[in-house]
Interface confidence: low
């Protein structure tokens, strides 16, 4: 790498007399005037705004006590204005200034782009006392420079409360490019158009940006960074990167994937979590999303039936969670179940059929025909039904429930009897005289209970009085 | 289910251009792409192009170019090839076969074939 | 474009026997891309294994494939007379899409 100085401003030694060491001296003014030479007046007019006082970056002292002669003006030399170099090289560069020597506690500071720099700097100040006056060289040396050393270098000097600032030293550090902006990987619709950013920055400028497809160069001629690169459309998955030059050399970007958007493999893995009468739960393991976030799934459902009409039911839910309750299914069915889902491409295809039960439900229909008879000189009632027309989904008949309310002045009592599948009259004891017994029946099966059948009443006197009430639900067809 | 029905069989003569037809059914269409595959009498498979039903967008084998002209027609879910300046070496079976494209192509599902007999 | 060698171009086989079929890439493929169909005689060519490995719908388990690279094989574990068919591998991996040349299966 080459290390350059370019002199930005003209050196203007300020002060007379040889200062130590190797820096330049000059007699010249600072305002380059031939025909001055020695101290310089206190009063000094801008070269720009002729006719206005110039102080800037200048402190003018005041009278001495003999107040027979002024003091000069104190300004830091100028120095070498623009230091270009490149990353993990040294560099070192100084600021001086002459000082009265009545001039005590003379601090010099350096200030980078606005701001002090404090701390763990490389900075060293020498004094260099004389008769009259103090040279002071202020060094700043950076080891290994950076892009961030990169910037604008003062140095900063209090007097009787003024402030004496120096020219700035420019510091340029030069490497390869440097990304600011990479591409990024996308996912895109076949055949639509898309962009891609790059973005590298020096020094040196400029950068100049190529664009890479799938390790072939995509423009000829290379663009001014920031570039974005329109690409019309892809109809297969492709890898862009750029590459970026500058007079150091080249650096190249990320690859990134650009993944054509696709529909989405079928999901995969449909398990039975539980099932009921009515219900089945369900899982899923989602398929490759084909490069397009899921939108929603659909459930299918046909019951494995030789007699059923082989219609599909669609339950459609949200992609997330990978979980649905299919409810509305018969009790005691098989069924058949694929999983499907969608992205903004279009439907997966369905997922592999499982196979699924419902387990027994609740007969549907209550016992037919019940009649209640009072039997007096047992002292009981003698209750019969008829077996209800239950659906085979209904399942096994395991019994029927009875419930028996009695009812007289003042009381109300309900009592439930359970008898077995093959009853088709049960007789209970009379609980309650004077009184009217309330008689309901429904059909159990291992899925539940059925509906009861409508109420059949009968009055139950007091002892000597007879009386039967027969009827409520009369067989199909009796009526 | 998934199904391509293709044309019936074609007798032409050289010179002349035909035009076979497939007609996709149990998908959504315009969703996947239509491909074409050639295969003369006792040989291999080999791949003519394919276009994309959404826009139709086309890609052809070189060899193919000029030759072979694919279209759709979405309304009725229908692809078409049409095969310009016919010689004997155009004598085959045509399939039509959609493509799960999803940057691990494949053919999934396939046409019946037309066989195309080029003769004077 | 990407040539698929297979071999053996034909092969007589019994019933019972373990049939292995290999598919040489000219080029690298990733095994995302590489496919098998069979055609039975006087019909289409059908799905068999795509993505190297994963049997399609349908397609008994005595079928497997594997590979990668350039190298890629199928197998059927036990040959069965219906297997009697064309053989055809395919990559899906770059334009021109391409298939190898075949494998008959006969039966001795």
């Known amino acids: 790498a080459i290390t350059e100085a370019r002199e930005e401003a003209k050196p203007y030694p300020l002060f007379p007399g040889p200062l130590p060491g190797s820096l330049q001296t000059d007699h010249t003014s600072l305002l380059s005037l031939p025909h001055t030479s020695g101290y310089q007046p206190a009063l000094m007019f801008s070269p720009t705004q002729p006719g206005r006082p110039y102080t800037g970056n200048v402190a003018i002292p005041r009278v001495t006590s003999a107040g027979s002669k002024l003091l000069p003006p104190l300004a830091f030399k100028h120095t070498v204005g623009h230091i270009i170099l490149s990353e993990h090289k040294d560099v070192k560069f100084n600021c001086s200034i002459s000082v009265p020597n009545i001039y005590q506690d003379t601090t010099i500071s350096w200030w980078k782009d606005g701001k002090e720099l404090l701390g763990a700097h490389h900075a060293i100040t020498q004094f260099y006392p004389d008769d009259e006056v103090t040279a002071i060289i202020a060094s700043f040396s950076i080891t290994s420079v950076q892009r961030s050393d990169n910037g604008s270098y003062i140095c900063k000097m209090k007097i009787n409360n003024e402030e004496i600032v120096s020219d700035p030293i420019y510091i340029e550090v030069q490497g390869l490019p440097h990304f600011t902006k990479q591409p990024e990987s996308m996912n895109v619709t076949r055949n639509t158009a898309f962009n891609l950013t790059c973005q590298a920055v020096g020094p040196p400028e400029p950068v100049n940006i190529f664009w890479v497809q799938n390790s072939s160069r995509v423009n000829e001629q290379p663009e001014k960074s920031p570039s974005v690169l329109t690409v019309p459309g892809l109809t297969e998955m492709a890898v862009f990167s750029c590459e970026a030059h500058n007079d150091k050399g080249l650096t190249v970007s990320k690859g990134v994937q650009i993944n054509i958007k696709a529909i989405p493999s079928p999901p995969t893995e449909v398990s039975i979590h539980n099932s009921t009468a009515h219900s089945i739960l369900i899982s899923w393991v989602p398929g490759f999303d084909g490069y397009s976030p899921f939108r929603n799934c659909s459930v299918q459902v046909k019951e494995v039936d030789p007699l059923s009409n082989g219609s599909v039911m669609i339950f459609n839910t949200s992609a997330s969670p990978h979980m649905y309750q299919i409810k509305q299914l018969q009790a005691l069915a098989n069924y058949s179940i694929g999983v499907s889902c969608m992205n903004e491409i279009g439907w997966s295809a369905v997922s592999p059929w499982i196979l699924a039960s419902t387990t027994e439900g609740a007969p549907s229909v209550a016992p037919l025909n019940v009649t209640v008879f009072l039997n007096e000189s047992r002292d009981n009632v003698d209750i019969r039904w008829m077996k209800p027309l239950t659906k085979r989904q209904a399942g096994e008949l395991v019994g029927y429930r009875i419930s028996h309310v009695w009812q007289s002045a003042g009381i109300s009592k309900e009592l439930l009897e359970e008898v077995g599948q093959n009853n088709s009259r049960a007789q209970i004891s009379v609980q309650v005289h004077n009184a009217t017994c309330t008689v309901r029946i429904a059909a159990v099966t291992k899925g539940g209970v059925g509906p009861f059948s409508d109420p059949v009443k009968i009055f139950i006197p007091a002892h000597g009085w007879v009386d039967h009430a027969p009827s409520s639900t009369p067989a199909p067809g009796n009526a | 289910q998934v199904q391509l029905q293709q044309s019936g069989p074609e007798l032409v003569k050289p010179g002349a251009s035909v035009k076979l037809s497939c007609k996709a059914s149990?998908?959504?269409?315009?969703?996947?792409?239509i491909n074409w595959v050639k295969q003369r009498p006792g040989q291999g498979l080999e791949w003519i192009g394919w276009i994309y039903p959404r826009d139709g967008y086309t890609k052809y084998k070189e060899k193919f170019k000029g030759k072979a002209t694919l279209t759709v027609d979405t309304s009725s879910s229908t692809a078409y090839m049409e095969l310009h300046s016919l010689t004997s070496e155009d004598s085959a079976v045509y399939f039509c076969?959609?493509?799960?494209?999803?940057?691990?192509?494949?053919?999934?599902?396939w046409g019946q074939g037309t066989t195309l007999t080029v003769s004077s | 474009e990407i040539v698929l060698t297979q071999s053996p171009t034909t092969m007589a086989t019994s019933p019972g026997e373990k049939i292995t079929i290999t598919c040489s890439a000219s080029s690298s493929i990733s095994s995302n891309y590489l496919h098998w169909y069979q055609q039975k005689p006087g019909f289409s060519p059908k799905l068999l294994i795509y993505?190297?490995?994963n049997l399609a719908s349908g397609v008994p388990d005595r079928f497997s494939g594997s590979g990668s690279g350039t190298s890629y094989s199928l197998t059927i574990g036990t040959m069965e007379a219906e297997d009697v068919a064309t053989y055809y591998c395919?990559?899906?991996?770059?334009?021109?899409?391409?298939f190898g040349a075949g494998t008959k299966l006969e039966l001795k």
């Open positions: 076969a959609r493509g799960f494209y999803s940057n691990l192509y494949y053919f999934d599902y």
């Open positions: 149990g998908y959504t269409f315009t969703s996947y792409d």
């Open positions: 395919q990559q899906g991996r770059s334009i021109p899409l391409t």
């Open positions: 993505r190297t490995s």
